[in-house]
């Protein structure tokens, strides 16, 4: 199946991180995963360097492997937790969500 | 091994391009490979998401693949080629050489 | 921009052959593979053959052992050969040509219009 965008929701809980966040228990984080192989097309947003590295593995496998399916785009999330000195805070957290895939 | 930056040359005779492009015969692309496995270490340049889905697959390897290792940094080649009307035009391509990899 | 103008679509009995023809034009330059995809109404397009500038084919599992994908870089057309045609091979088929992104990040696909291949039994 080629490079695509799968569902992941993370809990909080199962990283062992709720005792330091507070909201949200978990989130959609989404991952990235599908192959990067000859021939690619305009939905699997190959990078240039990506196009070349699929063409080198596919003439001969040997020398290098496929490019990977990896994020594109991500997106921040909202992280309302305690601090070393037990205050509220609220951040955002950048790169947390997938938004697109790609062949890089 | 970690992910990391490896040696490739890429001739362009190789790829079939020698009749359009002029110059240079091929370009030190480089591609990236290895591991992004737990514990990440700063040298691995892991996203957010990337450190996320790291624990998430560490915890149960099912659910996800480990992040994969990519180019976080890529630069330009200027190539002399001839165009569709036969001239000779000196052209930048983006993102066709790996200046640094992380995982993804 | 690349144009790309597909022929030698058709009706043909099951068991006969047709050859498809590609010819591309524009900024050809930078084309890295060519193929023929193909699609029925109400399922996705998918991969019958491509070939890349150096002459590496890859075939999709319908295409294998029966249709040969070549090109004539002096053309600019691509082949798709096709024999032992069976009526589940009736499809509008597509020629794909893939290049290098610029100045995008991205690699860009141009389609022809399609031809239409219809295998009677």
């Known amino acids: 199946q080629a490079c695509k965008k799968h569902e992941l929701y993370v809990s909080f809980r199962d990283l062992g991180w709720q005792d330091w966040i507070i909201a949200p228990e978990g989130y959609a984080a989404y991952y990235c995963e599908g192959e990067c192989a000859f021939p690619l097309n305009s939905y699997m947003n190959a990078t240039n360097h990506a196009i070349v590295q699929t063409l080198v593995h596919f003439i001969n496998p040997e020398t290098v492997p496929k490019p990977c399916c990896a994020p594109t785009q991500l997106n921040a999330i909202s992280v309302l937790y305690f601090d070393d000195s037990s205050n509220v805070i609220l951040k955002k957290y950048r790169n947390m969500v997938v938004r697109a895939c790609g062949c890089h | 091994q970690a992910c990391k930056k490896h040696e490739l040359y890429v001739s362009f005779r190789d790829l079939g391009w020698q009749d359009w492009i002029i110059a240079p015969e091929g370009y030190a692309a480089y591609y990236c490979e290895g591991e992004c496995a737990f514990p990440l270490n700063s040298y691995m340049n892991a996203t957010n998401h990337a450190i996320v889905q790291t624990l998430v697959h560490f915890i149960n390897p099912e659910t996800v693949p480990k992040p994969c290792c990519a180019p976080t940094q890529l630069n330009a080649i200027s190539v002399l080629y001839f165009d569709d009307s036969s001239n000779v035009i000196l052209k930048k391509y983006r993102n066709m050489v790996v200046r640094a990899c992380g995982c993804h | 921009e690349v144009q790309l103008v597909e022929s030698g679509g058709g009706l043909v009995q099951a068991g006969g052959s047709l050859r498809l023809s590609c010819a591309a034009s524009g900024s050809i330059f930078s084309i890295v593979s060519m193929g023929w995809y193909r699609q029925v109404p109400g399922k996705q397009r998918e991969l019958v053959a491509a070939?890349?500038?150096?002459?590496?084919?890859n075939y999709g599992d319908s295409a294998k052992g029966r249709f040969t994908i070549s090109r004539d870089n002096a053309k600019n057309t691509v082949y798709l050969q096709m024999n032992s045609l069976k009526p589940e091979d009736t499809a509008v088929y597509y020629c794909?040509?893939?290049?290098?992104?610029?100045?995008?990040?991205?690699?860009?696909?141009?389609w022809g219009k399609g031809t239409l291949v219809t295998v009677s039994s």
């Open positions: 070939i890349t500038s150096a002459g590496s084919t």
């Open positions: 794909n040509s893939y290049g290098l992104g610029y100045p995008g990040d991205y690699g860009i696909d141009y």
